[in-house]
Interface confidence: medium
Amino acid sequence: EAHKSEIAHRFKDLGEQHFKGLVLIAFSQYLQKCPYEEHIKLVQEVTDFAKTCVADENAENCDKSIHTLFGDKLCAIPKLRDNYGELADCCAKQEPERNECFLQHKDDNPNLPPFQRPEAEAMCTSFQENPTSFLGHYLHEVARRHPYFYAPELLYYAEKYNEVLTQCCTESDKAACLTPKLDAVKEKALVAAVRQRMKCSSMQRFGERAFKAWAVARMSQRFPNAEFAEITKLATDVTKINKECCHGDLLECADDRAELAKYMCENQATISSKLQACCDKPVLQKSQCLAEIEHDNIPADLPSIAADFVEDKEVCKNYAEAKDVFLGTFLYEYSRRHPDYSVSLLLRLAKKYEATLEKCCAEGDPPACYGTVLAEFQPLVEEPKNLVKTNCELYEKLGEYGFQNAVLVRYTQKAPQVSTPTLVEAARNLGRVGTKCCTLPEAQRLPCVEDYLSAILNRLCVLHEKTPVSEKVTKCCSGSLVERRPCFSALTVDETYVPKEFKAETFTFHSDICTLPDKEKQIKKQTALAELVKHKPKATEDQLKTVMGDFAQFVDKCCKAADKDNCFATEGPNLVARSKEALA
């Protein structure tokens, strides 16, 4: 239904607190360099304006679109060109081109320092003094570093942050209470960020149809008792919601997400038996709970999928009559039977089925031609199963850090042209798959591993797109989203790469490494490892092990020395010489 004032409508639906949070996220995601104080001033102005429109929908400018109102606010910022360069050119455009222009200038890797968590005491003091401002800073800092973060979900994490601080800041040992809890929130939020970026990439590159196929598969796995048309309705709504958030329509996105949660809770009988616990929660928690809901039990009496999709004499007729619907039903029926498959795999199988029908329905004897299609799925299913098996075995043998290093070597060999920080970040994230997925029950491993890897590889693609340096990476990133992971897995050592010159300064370390937190120490070592591989792409596992072992001992020894600086200065060149020799 149309509303006289879109902004008044959203303000009333969302309530002031969520409205302000979403406006802050929107501004922080568009203008990533602006300080919090500047954004919060704009948020207050927009909120005050929204209130005037709630009081009188006919008031001046209340009929303007939210993009127009937000864009006008952003373009009125003084010194916009000084701080943002060509992004200021967007302001010369009219809506909707202006918003499109803002979206194109979102930076996935902004030049911002890593978000440092303050000391527990300091954190509690500022939280207790002004919780609203404290949580506002959290929204701002996360949103500017993750310009595609799913806004209603970020509000949920801010709520979690609030809960943790409220609980822990009354404890005597605040740090002991805060650290593990905030680490858990951070870990979940970082995974959410890469997953949502993948969804926006899917939407941007391949459109709504591709995203809807993803949603149909996912919903069918979760709600195997829901009928196809119900799944279609849910997938259509989820597609619309994600399109809005990816497109910067955060108020509409959050409002529609709350509506979908309401619909699901009102229609539990036709969706899933598992929803009730979620439906008793307040709105943000309800939506999050529904998004993470466990799979419903598969109906016991499902007939073989072959009946409708292989044995039926009318397969080609049904397909020709309504291709998308027929393929959608195939994806639905296959997915609801296989919660143990990744969505990527299910989409590959649907693609294979589609290609088979395209080919066979044009031939003389279609049933004979497509009769073996389900058997032809076998290699497509075996490939990711083997990937999971070998990688989880390696993870169990090496542990997380060792597994990350193995992945780092592998990926540096595949794409040595990619910048070392990007390779290290990707390998560290890819390596976490072990901790995240390999400990799960067998039936949950494959979907966990492959869908997580796909999201991490999407991040690699997004960063590489900004400064393309490797033809192989470009090739894998340009293809279909569901083929990306198999494409990367199939890459071998890049034979075209000319090894990097050995630079002693790359492997020169100082005593400052000793005071770094463990994570930063690991990153330093992994940076050195990637550089070694770039210098010697064909170095054997044993050679690399020797050099890295030597390096670890050197750091350990010098950090324990009385005169650390002297130790690093004298032992460092010896290490470099030994390393060169070991790799010769």
């Epitope: 009928e227 048309a229 007939p303 409708d308």
Partner: nanobody, 126 residues
């Protein structure tokens, strides 16, 4: 959008049989669960039978027709059928065909996306 047209109604003796058909136009027939409802003069519309979106789909029946009526569908012909055997005078009603997202909601006579036909009259004389 789905348009539905019923046929096959008529006058029949108690104990006789009739086969109702409902043809759907629109390219998304396969996406919908299909069902039959009936309304006797002066009474509420009541659920008769429903079938999920596939030809061999799950079927649901009202207790009053179980074992006598059979619902089936032919997706190629975008048609749903209701085979009515051992008809009784109390089966006399206007029979409606319906399309909805869910066969389960149809049983509760509250289709979420209700598409209705105009109805076909069935009269069973004793």
């Amino acid at each position: 959008q789905v348009q539905l047209v019923e046929s096959g109604g008529g006058l029949v003796q108690a104990g006789g049989s009739l086969r109702l058909s409902c043809v759907a136009s629109g390219r998304t027939f396969i996406a919908y669960a299909m069902g039959w409802f009936r309304q006797a003069p002066g009474k509420e519309r009541e659920f008769v039978a429903a079938i999920t979106n596939f030809a061999g789909g799950t079927t649901y029946y009202a207790d009053s027709v179980k074992g006598r009526f059979t619902i089936s569908r032919d997706n190629a012909k975008t048609t749903v059928y209701l085979q009515m055997n051992s008809l009784k005078p109390e089966d006399t009603a206007l029979y409606y065909c319906a399309a909805d997202r869910s066969a389960q909601t149809m049983r509760q006579v509250r289709p979420v996306l209700p598409y209705w036909g105009q109805g076909t009259q069935v009269t069973v004389s004793s």
